[in-house]
């Protein structure tokens, strides 16, 4: 006890009262009023405490202290007397704050801020909505996704912020009268191929798909080496002259050049160049059989090889090139004899008629396109004079039962076997490749040397064998009639033609003989 | 008939780029090659390259690649070849020619001169 | 690519005489077209793939050759003659000309 009679034991925020007893100082409470032992503690009263007599007032919140409280206006309010604390009611100044007004930027760019008391709240804009996480957060709505997809199904549906579209897919375009992208908007596929909007490459046809196009190669073509076809950037080379090469083992000079040139002519080879092209190839092959060189000095079945070859090339590339000529009619003739007669026409229902000095072709023209195929017809006839050369002494097999017949109405082949090549080797093709089964015959009218009296003229046709040469055969072909210089053949197929005189001994007047006019 | 009408003498600055015309008349104009060819004063004929007129496609020879390019615009049946990074060697007559393969270059524009002087 | 060697490279003739002028190619040629030029004119197809004479050529002129070896040749020289020939390939990229044969008359 000190010299004043005061307690100095008394706990934390008490006083002593005298040298026996403390009291808790204001603010602090403890079990009973006066404290006379040293184990009793003073603890803070909570003036803020629900049984409380403490009233701070509206908009305010009352703040514990140690030994003390505070009153301080809510979070959305201020004092007007600019004082942050007070102790009653009657102290209250607290009013709400504006936030819209003291922060325009609070609810970002897509929201429009209200004032309420105390607080604010952002309301979006139109395509947007409130964030779950961020309640004062406008965020975009993806109409696209959110199920609520308004678009049609020719169109595909792109958000925006704030708002979507529904567009033309790609390859499709607006209906006429329909916009393109608002969410009436109706769409419908667009024919790049008709309307000039594809990228084709001019080796291939433009092929319309739904929404989009694809490029295929053009009849006889084929995809450059590693690109694919049916692509929008396929690119395509012309197969006519690749395959068209001089034939294994045969050695010549003469050969060789007439290859070297087609090769040539095929390097740069572009669909526009298609009528110079066949004129350029068939003046190098009339000028090969006016002068063979060392052909003629080839053996004959070699001879006959190379003619087979020839004949069987010209063919696929008269047809390939051909494809590529606008509509109407082509006669070209060379010095030689050489004479290419060909009809190009988008199909019609008619029959075509081919005229040449030494032939003509009479054929339908259904036959000349196959069923699918976008190209024109074709219908051509090359009269080839100068293969006769090569075909001399060239084999004739006969069907067994022309044989026959040929055995009961003649005595025989005479000495001398082979037959003679009366008229020009012609060679007839058409846009279809598939000519080996026509449904309605072609009629050829040859002209041609003089027949000798009581032998037997044939038509026929030049059959590639598997060896790669081949022989005269009839099978399909048969003779209609024939006069002194002329003769009428009819066949279900189509190869390269000629009109044989076979050496048989017509023992008396033959009917088939007979002249028909 | 067939006639090729070639673009107006030029005179040109070191390092400039000149684009020579060849309008072409009397016939399918995207039908034929068109090739370019140089002549420099009293020397002989230099092949520069050929462009395609139906599809655009372009042949050259290695030296004038990055020198020349050849374009054709099929509207107005021309052909166009231009020459950049110009230097005192390409001061030439060009000469533009319709060509196929087995015809030789029957057609001859009147030729261009370029001069290029600082 | 394809060199060809034109000789001579400068020859006179006299009218009426024959003239002779070859070109050699470095590699197998099928296609073979000559032109001739005059000083400050263009240059003029004169004969193409090989022997055929371009329209309007007088027929004194003739082609002939295959292979790596062609020749060009003017039966009986004239004054209108005189100019530079030219041959020229196209059998394989790039096309080439031959260097010219300047021909004069004598």
């Known amino acids: 006890q000190d010299s004043r009679g005061c307690a100095r034991w008394c706990p934390q925020d008490s006083s002593c009262v005298n040298a026996t007893a403390c009291r808790c100082n204001p603010g602090f409470s403890s079990f009973s009023e006066i404290i006379t032992t040293p184990m009793e503690t003073c603890d803070d009263i909570n003036e803020c405490a629900t049984l409380s007599k403490v009233s701070c007032g509206k908009f305010s919140d009352c703040w514990n202290t140690e030994g003390s409280y505070d009153c301080v206006c809510s979070p959305g309010y201020e004092p007007v007397s600019g004082a942050k604390t007070f102790k009653n009611e009657s102290e209250n100044t607290c009013q709400d704050v504006d936030e819209c007004q003291q922060n325009p930027r609070l609810c970002k760019s897509y929201g429009t801020c209200v004032n309420t008391l105390g607080s604010y709240t952002c309301q979006c804009l139109p395509g947007f909505k409130l964030k779950p996480e961020d309640p004062k957060l406008c965020t975009d709505v993806n109409e696209c996704t959110s199920g609520q997809n308004p678009c049609h199904s020719s169109t595909h549906c792109l958000n925006n912020v704030g708002s979507y579209q529904c567009r033309c897919r790609p390859g499709w375009q607006p209906i006429p009268g329909s916009p393109n992208g608002p969410n009436n908007t109706v769409c419908e596929d667009v024919d790049e191929c008709s309307s000039g909007q594809h990228q084709c490459d001019s080796s291939t046809v433009c092929f319309n798909t739904v929404g989009s196009y694809s490029c295929r190669c053009r009849p006889g073509w084929k995809p450059r080496h590693g690109i694919p076809n049916n692509q929008k950037d396929t690119v395509c080379e012309d197969m006519t002259f690749s395959t068209w090469t001089p034939p294994p083992g045969v050695h010549s000079q003469t050969l060789s050049r007439f290859f070297d040139k087609v090769q040539d002519l095929g390097r740069d080879y572009k669909p526009g160049l298609a009528n110079n092209t066949i004129q350029s190839i068939l003046q190098a092959l009339d000028e090969l059989l006016e002068a063979p060189g060392d052909l003629e000095t080839l053996p004959r079945l070699q001879q006959h090889c190379v003619a087979s070859h020839l004949l069987d090339g010209l063919e696929d590339v008269l047809r390939g090139l051909s494809k590529n000529l606008s509509n109407g009619l082509l006669n070209f003739s060379y010095p030689a004899g050489t004479e290419l007669s060909l009809e190009v026409q988008k199909q019609v229902d008619r029959s075509v008629t081919l005229r040449q000095n030494q032939a003509v072709m009479q054929l339908d023209w259904n036959q000349a396109q196959k069923s699918g195929d976008p190209g024109p017809s074709v219908v051509g006839l090359v009269s080839i004079p100068g293969m006769g050369k090569l075909l001399a002494e060239a084999p004739l097999v006969l069907e067994p039962e022309k044989q026959m017949l040929l055995h009961e109405t003649h005595q025989g082949l005479l000495q001398d076997g082979s037959p003679i090549l009366l008229s020009d080797v012609i060679s007839a093709f058409l846009s279809n490749n598939d000519t080996q089964n026509l449904s309605s015959p072609v009629t050829f009218t040859f002209s041609h040397r003089s027949v000798i009296p009581r032998q037997k003229v044939l038509c026929v046709f030049w059959e590639h064998g598997q060896n790669g040469c081949g022989h005269w055969a009839t099978t399909g072909c048969s003779t209609i009639g024939t006069r002194d210089t002329s003769t009428i053949c009819r066949c279900t197929h189509l190869s390269s033609f000629a009109v044989l005189m076979a050496h048989y001994d017509v023992q008396e007047e033959d009917p088939v003989l007979t002249v028909i006019t | 008939q067939v006639q090729l009408q070639q673009s107006g003498a030029e005179l040109a600055r070191p390092g400039a780029s000149v684009k020579l015309s060849c309008k072409a008349s009397g016939y399918t104009f995207t039908n034929y090659w068109m090739q370019w060819i140089k002549q420099r004063p009293g020397q002989g004929l230099e092949w520069i390259g050929a462009?395609?007129?139906?599809?655009?496609?372009?042949m050259m020879t290695q030296k004038f690649k990055g020198k020349a390019t050849l374009t054709a615009d099929k509207s107005s049946s021309t052909a166009y070849m231009q020459v950049s990074s110009l230097a005192s060697e390409d001061s030439a007559v060009y000469y533009c020619?319709?060509?196929?393969?087995?015809?030789?270059?029957?057609?001859w524009g009147q030729g261009t001169s370029v001069t290029v002087s600082s | 690519q394809i060199v060809l060697t034109q000789s001579p490279a400068v020859m006179s003739a006299s009218p009426g005489e024959k003239v002779t002028m070859t070109c050699s190619a470095s590699s197998s040629v099928s296609y073979m077209h000559w032109y001739q030029q005059k000083s400050g004119t263009s240059p003029k197809r004169w004969i193409y793939?090989?022997?055929k004479l371009a329209s309007g050529v007088p027929n004194r002129f003739s082609g002939s050759g295959s292979g790596t070896s062609y020749s060009f040749t003017i039966r009986s020289m004239e004054a209108e003659d005189a100019a530079t020939y030219y041959c020229?390939?196209?059998?394989?990229?790039?096309?080439?000309f031959g260097a010219g044969t300047k021909l004069e008359l004598k």
């Open positions: 462009v395609y007129p139906g599809d655009g496609d372009t």
């Open positions: 020619a319709r060509g196929f393969t087995a015809y030789g270059m029957d057609y």
């Open positions: 793939d090989t022997s």
């Open positions: 020229q390939q196209w059998s394989s990229n790039p096309l080439t």
